[in-house]
Each structure stands twice: as C-alpha cells, then as structure tokens.
Interface confidence: medium
C-alpha cells in the first residue's frame, strides 16, 4: 500500500504566440481545481478506461478576477498536494490524466458552473520511494508544471511497496534470511505471512493473508492436486472434493464493488459501475456533492447540494457512466454497412468504405459498370462494386480481351478429353459415357440413361458443346 502524490506548481499560458485569454473576468470571477486519474501500465486509452489505480480531486484555488487589459498570468492554485492512495502494489509503470477545471462564481442560477479548461495525459515509469519527478505538459495554449512521486505506507517498503518492514528484534542483526530494510536500516524486512494453513510447498503469497497456488494445485490452501478429467461443469461443484481443474475465483466473485455497485469482468481485472453518489475503483468514495466536481469529461452536474442528496451528471456526447467517466465506443454499434471501417472522431463518426461502396454509412452500392466496356461481345455485370465482364464464348479476362482456353476448367466428365473448337469446345468421351460433357453413363445393353443420344451420334463419339 502507499500514496501517489501530485504537486501542481503552475498553470498558465504556454510559451509562444497565441496566449490564451484569461478564463476569469471581473464579470465572471472564477477559481481553479484539479482532478487526477491514475491507471496501471502504459495504457493507451488514458481518457476512456476507469481510473483503476485511483483518482483524486484537489481543493478549490483562490478566487481570481482578471485585471482588465492584462495577459493571462499563471493562475492562483489550490493549496496542498493531490494524494491518490493505492491499496495494492505500486505497478512501476502508470498512466495519468490531469484535468484543470474552472469553477465560475458569477450569478449562475442554481449555483456555480464548472467547465474543463485543459486535460493532459501521459505514461511514465516511476519507482516507489524515489525522489520527486518534475514534469511539464502542454494542452493547447496552456502549460501545466507539476511534480509527482509514489511513496509506500509503513510497514511496506521497496520500489513496488510489496516488502514489509518491522522494527529489529535485536539491536545488531535481522532474523535468519531477512535483510535490513533500506533506507530504514534500523528495521528489518518482515517475512510475508500467508493465509494460515497455506501449503508451503504448493502455495505462496504476494500480499499478507493470501494463498496463491502454483500450477497443478488448487483449493483455498493449495493442497488439492488438479485433475483435468471428470469435471462436470466449468465452475464445478467443488474443486476440493473432485480435484477438478476449475477457474480460480473470478474477479467479480464476492462482488468487490461497494455501495451497491455492480461488477463486470474485464480481460485482466474487473470494473465497477457505481450508483450515483459514489465513484472510485470499488465505488468506495462517497459523500460526493456537485461542489466536488464529480462529473468527468465536461459533464454537467445537477442537484446534489449536500452529501445526502444525489447528484446527476449530464454527459456530453461520446461519454457515459454515472460520472461521465467512460467514453462511448460508438463504433462498437457497427454503424458502417458493407464492411466499412468505423472511425470515431469524437465530434463525429466516419466510415471508410470498401471499394465499390459510398455514402456516410457505406450504404450505397456503386454501379461499377458505368462507363465500362467489355470487349469481344462481353456484357458488364454489376457485382457490388466489382467490375465484372461476362465474356462471350472463347474470351476471358477482366475485360474479355484475352482468348480463353475453353478446356482450362476441365469441363469433360468421367475422363473425357477436351478439344478447343472455333465454336466452343468438344468432349471426346471415354468408353461408357456420352453427352455434351460426357456426363451420362451408357448402360451395358446400349440404352443410355437420359437423354438419348442424338440421331447419328454414337456413344463415344466427340460431342460438341455449343
């Protein structure tokens, strides 16, 4: 366990031309506040996925009124750090979003109004226990300067806050196999205490009180060998009794979502959908009012004047969730017809159409025969965008410009031999077969089985196919 700490140093116009106008004025005094969202790993979807490592909201900064005619200076900031506690190990790599919000304090009906001034996002590597890291990020014409660090909460230490430390039991040394806890040299690394009864051979733990099984073992204490046979169902009745290989507890088993939140499994973890008034990874953050600015991504907060009354976030287009924290994947609705690829541009959807289709949703089938000519008496066939020629006998190719070999498709059945002919092809049938393509067997008594040979043609004679 530990805490991620963020110190905002300044927020103001960035270098270069085009300085932004001050967000506040004499008519509209305002103050700033900040939100930070953290996720483990080098996530590419910084704005969309939930803040799995945690989120924090700053206090409001001092009220600021622009001096007439003056350029926008660095704006007055809230006091103190933004702190995001993390319960589990620090992941080492993380993604962040820092949002700068403006609270307008004019004569709005229904209280103050909030608007998002800037959002910056990034991906960083950071070891817990290290020094403050400084950063500068730009969002449009604005520039944000800040520092951050991750620190472990005692008794945890180490770059991931997974080692535990205890005061030394003897003044001079640590116990057998235990190292001093740098930088706390007067303390010793504490052994992890796994769940009572956890098999020392087949189980291990990364957090106190847990019991995780090595491959081939199962059960709450990792004492049951896995057998892959005789399993009745994917989550069989009892792995402990049958020795069946069953999935470990699903991430939603036992519902980790507090305060009535509903849990859904994700490929690597779980996601809580929180009722109004609650947010956080496990819906554990409560007592939120509109004054806390609970709506992400420019959502408008209504109601919730005190902690006992619920607020509602009215989300802008493209966002959803009780706090507007989820981006709507509008492309998942598969709006593009005929195999078009979907691009969600934020303000609009675009479809990239496959060849032969057009229209906002690729719904129009282009007639590719328009203005096309097929040579040698061929006719153009519209094939959903594919320019196709149906060629006259003896010709082939995309535009019927090539002389075709009528025998290439091996049209003569039952071992008949094919001969190209000026009017098409001729099949010389093997003994016992007849017909234009040698498709009809001849009965031993000489009577053919459908249809009768044309007059003057003996079975086995070449059959011309016109």
């Amino acid at each position: 366990a530990g805490v991620f700490e963020l110190q905002i140093h300044s927020f103001g116009p960035g270098p270069g031309p085009g300085a932004p106008r001050s967000p506040c004025s004499a008519r509209l005094p305002c103050r700033l506040f900040f939100r930070v969202c953290l996720k483990p790993g080098l996530s590419e979807e910084a704005a969309e996925s939930p803040c799995a490592l945690g989120a924090a909201l700053s206090a409001r900064g001092p009220v600021y009124t622009e001096q007439p005619g003056a350029p926008a200076p660095d704006l007055p900031l809230p006091d103190g750090l933004l702190q995001v506690p993390f319960r589990d190990a620090w992941p080492g790599t993380f993604s962040f979003i820092i949002e700068t919000w403006r609270e307008e304090l004019g004569d709005q009906i229904g209280g103050p109004a909030w608007s998002l001034l800037a959002r910056v996002a990034g991906r960083r590597r950071l070891a817990a226990g290290g020094p403050w890291a400084r950063d500068i990020q730009r969002a449009g014409a604005w520039e944000l300067r800040f520092s951050y660090r991750a620190r472990c909460e005692p008794p945890a230490v180490g770059t991931a806050c997974t080692r535990l430390c205890r005061p030394r039991s003897a003044p001079s040394r640590c116990g057998p196999g235990l190292r001093p806890c740098a930088p706390l040299e007067d303390e010793c690394e504490a052994p992890l205490v796994c769940r009572a009864g956890c098999s020392p051979e087949h189980g291990f733990c990364e957090q106190p009180g847990e019991c995780r099984c090595l491959e081939g073992w199962t059960g709450p204490l990792c004492t049951v060998p896995v057998s892959t046979s005789s399993c009745l169902s994917p989550r069989g009745p009892s792995s402990a009794t049958t020795g069946c290989l069953v999935p470990g507890p699903g991430p939603c088993d036992g519902n980790p979502c507090a305060n009535g939140g509903s849990c859904s499994e994700t490929p690597r973890s779980f996601e809580c959908t929180c009722p109004r008034g609650f947010y956080g990874l496990r819906c554990e953050v409560s007592g939120v009012t509109c004054a806390d600015g609970p709506c992400f991504n420019g959502g408008l907060c209504v109601g919730g004047a005190d902690p006992d009354s619920a607020y509602i976030c009215h989300c802008p287009p493209g966002f959803q969730g009780s706090n507007c924290e989820k981006r709507v994947d509008r492309c998942s609705l598969q709006p593009c017809r005929n195999g078009g690829l979907c691009l969600d541009l934020g303000h609009a959807l675009r479809c990239r159409c496959r060849a032969g289709f057009a229209g906002p949703r690729c719904e129009h089938d282009l007639d590719d025969c328009a203005g096309r000519a097929c040579a040698n008496g061929g006719t153009c066939v519209e094939g959903g965008g594919a320019h196709r020629c149906s060629c006259a006998l003896g010709f082939g190719g995309r535009d019927c410009r090539e002389r075709a070999d009528p025998c290439a498709a091996r049209p003569c059945a039952h071992g008949g031999r094919c001969y190209a002919h000026f009017s098409g092809l001729v099949c010389a049938c093997a003994p016992g077969y007849m017909g234009a393509r040698c498709e009809f067997p001849v009965h031993p008594d000489g009577a053919s089985a459908l249809p009768a040979a044309p007059p003057g043609l003996r079975p086995g004679d070449p059959q011309r196919y016109l």
Epitope: Q334, L341, A386
Partner: antibody, heavy 119, light 107 residues
C-alpha cells in the same frame, strides 16, 4: 502469386496470450485489408476482426470483449493477431485472410495456425 | 449479430448429379453472401460473392442465387474434386458471420 504464410502451432496455458503472424507476399501489402478468422474443432468459422494495413485502423468482433488485438508490420508485410486471457475454448485453428477490396470479403487465406490451450 | 443457418448438414450426391446447399440469414443481407470451399490440407477457397458473382478461376458448374434472407449454392454436375465442406458467410455488416457448414460427399 498471392501467398499468406502463417506461423507454426502453439500450445499455451490458460490465462496466457498468443501472437500469431501472417506473412504476405505476391501483392502490395498496404493495399488490401487483412481479416482474422478462427475455427474451433467441429465448429463453424468465426470472424475475429479486420485491419487496414495502410494506417492500422481495425474493427473487432465484440464477442472477444477486448481480448483480441490485430497489428501489422508494413516493413515486413506481416499481420499479427494477439489473443489474451486464453481459455480452453480458444483452442482453434486461426486463419488470416486477405480482403479482396471489392465486396468479396476474403479471396486468399493462410494455411491456418493451430493454437491449443491446455493446463 | 446476424445468424447464418445452413442446410443440410451433409449431402451425398452421385458424380455428375446436381448438389444444392441452402443458407438462411436471420435478417436481410441484401445480396451480400459469399460461399467458401474448405478441403483438408488446402487453403480455404472463395467460390461466390454478392450472392451470385462467380470468383475468378472458379469452374462455372458452381453458381449462387438468392437475396434478402434465403440463398442457394448449386453445383450443377458434381465432380470428385468437389468433395469438401462448404460455408456461407454474410458480408453485409460486421461482425461477419458464417453458416455451420455443409459436408458434400459422393454417393
């Protein structure tokens, strides 16, 4: 001659990931989209997704709940399909297939890569 | 998703005879249906697309018909090399979906 040559068979444990490659030759790689399709033993073919190699824009079958990622390396004329959080029901033959650019979706197919998921 | 239902599951036809396979979609897919041939040890082969357009190089004993929800693949004169499993697939909208397959054998 258009050819799609896929990587060899893989055996994986549940929870792991697998990355299958598909090397294209005989045509301009960035001019044709690439599909991935799988077929579990005794089952029908199942479309997984498609990518436009010219800019890596992709569309995925939502059935896979974000477990599938399709990428390309245009310098190597190779498409990749990665499937994460594998389960036993992901045991299948995985195919890449070239999109014909007209309405026929898949005109050339790879030979298939067998992925077995077993503990 | 659009569900594609193929019938029959298997079909035994004499050499030179006609083979007919049906495919039905749960909603209209206009003409956007493809047929594929799958043989062991060979790559899958596109036969027909847009319901009735013959893919280049495919023998003209193969033909496709239908639109909306009901489609048919016909092999006018079955040859030994036509023994295979045949799949229909809608290419009208994502996710593309396939039928369950029809195994064609020689009687």
């Amino acid at each position: 001659e258009v050819q799609l040559v896929q990587s060899g068979a893989e055996v994986k444990k549940p929870g792991a990931s697998v990355k299958v490659s598909c090397k294209a030759s005989g045509y301009t790689f960035t001019s044709y989209w690439m599909h991935w399709v799988r077929q579990a033993p005794g089952q029908r073919l199942e479309w997984m997704g498609v990518i436009d190699p010219s800019d890596s824009l992709a569309n995925y079958n939502q059935e896979f709940k974000g477990r599938v990622t399709i990428t390309v390396d245009t310098s190597a004329s190779t498409a990749y399909m990665e499937l994460s959080s594998l389960r036993s029901e992901d045991t299948a033959v995985y195919y890449c297939a070239r999109d014909s650019t007209v309405v026929a979706p898949m005109d050339y197919w790879g030979q298939g890569t067998t992925v077995t998921v077993s503990s | 998703d659009i569900v594609m239902t193929q019938s029959p599951d298997s079909l035994a036809v004499s050499l030179g005879e006609r083979a007919t396979i049906n495919c039905r979609a749960t909603k209209s897919i206009s003409k956007y249906l493809a047929w594929y041939q799958q043989k062991p040890g060979q790559t899958n082969k596109l036969l027909i697309f847009s319901g009735s357009t013959l893919q280049s190089g495919v023998p003209d004993r193969f033909s496709g018909s239908g639109s909306g929800t009901d489609f048919t693949l016909t092999i006018s004169s079955l040859q030994a090399e036509d023994v295979a499993v045949y799949y229909c697939q809608q290419h009208h909208e994502y996710p593309y979906t396939f039928g369950g397959g029809t195994k064609v054998e020689i009687k």
